[in-house]
């Protein structure tokens, strides 16, 4: 990969091992855990990153009310099965043969079952709502400055096309970033909103996935934007299928 050529490292993914063992002795970077060669000029898929992480030697408001069908990643970390494209396989199972269906960001969207569980297709997450609460500041941030800074961040750091950042809402101290990307909108080479959201989430937690770059230093007009809590909601093109028992719990 040309992005990794100079000193054989992967700028966009520190969870790789790079070696001059590609065609013609070129630098090639493989994701930990899966061994899949990754493109270091763009973001690595969330599935490969999760696999690498598991294998590594660790009222009239402007705010959006998440839809009743929105999913939150309550299950936490697991060692996923990725397809040859690096995407999540629709059906995931653990070591004890408990299986469940996931969406394109790897979040469970059905009740857990056994090996007979069928997941016919990988359902796309087309709308992601990132809900942030920032630490107290002297005053509120200017909404348009905040909007511009977050859009710049997603465009420059995560290489997400600006058209996929649908909106930035702000009601101190809550910031909401809406990412939208339908299957029909996503062209070859476009960063997936799920991958961008995952990189952002890890950045916010101080666990940057970028090689050698400093952590995320978010500033709005020179004022540090420090996030104290993050909640991410995922909305799928087809609503999830949970039993009533879970919905009423």
């Amino acid at each position: 990969h040309t992005a990794a050529q100079d000193n054989c490292t992967c700028p966009t993914n520190k969870m790789t091992v790079c070696s001059p063992d590609g065609p013609g002795g070129r630098c090639q970077c493989r994701a930990l855990g899966s061994g899949m060669a990754v493109d270091c000029s763009t973001l690595t898929s969330k599935c490969l990153l999760l696999k690498a992480r598991m294998s590594a030697p660790k009222n009239a408001r402007t705010l959006v009310r998440p839809s009743e069908h929105a999913l939150v990643d309550n299950d936490g970390l697991y060692d996923p099965d990725c397809d040859p494209e690096g995407r999540f396989k629709a059906r995931q199972c653990n070591q004890t043969s408990v299986c469940w269906c996931v969406n394109s960001v790897g979040v469970r969207r059905t009740d857990k079952g056994d090996l007979s569980l069928r997941c016919d297709e990988l359902v796309r997450t087309h709308h992601i709502l990132i809900d942030l609460r920032h630490r107290p500041t002297a005053g509120a941030f200017n909404h348009s400055d905040l909007d511009a800074e977050l859009r710049r961040l997603f465009r420059e750091r995560y290489r997400l096309h600006p058209k996929f950042v649908a909106a930035v809402h702000y009601e101190q101290p809550t910031i909401q970033i809406e990412l939208r990307q339908n299957t029909s909108q996503k062209a070859a080479g476009d960063v997936d909103i799920g991958d961008a959201a995952y990189y952002f989430e890890r950045d916010i937690k101080g666990e940057s996935l970028f090689q050698g770059r400093g952590g995320l230093d978010l500033r709005v007009r020179g004022e540090p934007l420090q996030v104290e809590r993050t909640l991410i909601y995922y909305l799928d093109e087809i609503p999830p299928k949970f039993s009533m028992k879970r919905l009423t719990a």
Epitope: P23, M36, A37
Partner: antibody
């Protein structure tokens, strides 16, 4: 030129362990993946796992987990593959190989015979 | 795991004739990031380690005679020997190194008719 030289044949009793070595020369040992491949008598090739000596990252084929341990000593540019709790089914030729798109470099193979 | 299936299991071809070995993988071996197929072909003679012939599905390893060629993409691959020579008698294996665990085909034994 690149060379991988493996240790000699071994005869072991069931239940014993064996450690096969693979000494690399002619290239920078720490920056290439090195894999181990098994070939039972008259059978095909099976990938057992690999190691990246520079950072000691190791991957195992699920089939061989608990049976094989792969290590490397960067000071001597030598990789090791240890088989534990040997059974007759472990009788095979074991190869080390430098991995990668254009890595046509294999050791000569080490025959491990398990017999009571 | 990716399953590699070769056909035929054995093949007898006359000297100077074309020999064709097929390899089918259970999942695509095409990496969308770099458009590279992670498939290699090896030749193994009795008592010897495998010898790399082709990598990236179609790139000939240096020193390999040009009668050997590889083709295919995704899940279907072919190794062709355009004019069989006596020294080509061996077992041929395809291998995926796309995703762990790397896997080999069961092998194709090539003989002279």
């Amino acid at each position: 030129q690149v060379q991988l030289v493996q240790s000699g044949p071994e005869v072991k009793k069931p239940g014993a362990s064996v450690k096969v070595s693979c000494k690399a020369s002619g290239y920078t040992f720490t920056i290439y993946w090195l894999g181990w491949v098994r070939q039972a008598p008259g059978q095909g090739l099976e990938w057992m796992g690999n190691i990246f000596p520079g950072s000691a990252y190791i991957n195992y084929n699920e089939k061989f987990k608990g049976k094989v341990t792969i290590t490397a000593d960067t000071s001597t540019s030598t990789a090791y593959m240890e088989l534990s709790s040997l059974r007759s089914e472990d009788t095979a030729v074991y190869f080390c190989a430098r991995e990668g798109s254009n890595s046509g470099y294999w050791g000569q193979g080490t025959l491990v015979t398990v017999s009571s | 795991d990716i399953v590699m299936t070769q056909s035929p299991d054995s093949l007898a071809v006359s000297l100077g004739e074309r020999a064709t070995i097929n390899c089918k993988s259970s999942q695509s071996l095409l990496n969308s990031g770099n458009q590279q197929n992670y498939l290699a072909w090896y030749q193994q003679k009795p008592g010897q380690p495998p010898k790399l012939l082709i990598y990236g599905a179609s790139t000939r390893e240096s020193g390999v005679p040009d009668r050997f060629s590889g083709s295919g993409s995704g899940t279907d691959f072919t190794l062709t020997i355009s004019s069989l020579q006596a020294e080509d008698v061996a077992v041929y294996y395809c291998q995926s190194d796309h995703i762990y665990p790397y896997t080999f085909g069961q092998g194709t034994k090539l003989e002279i008719k």
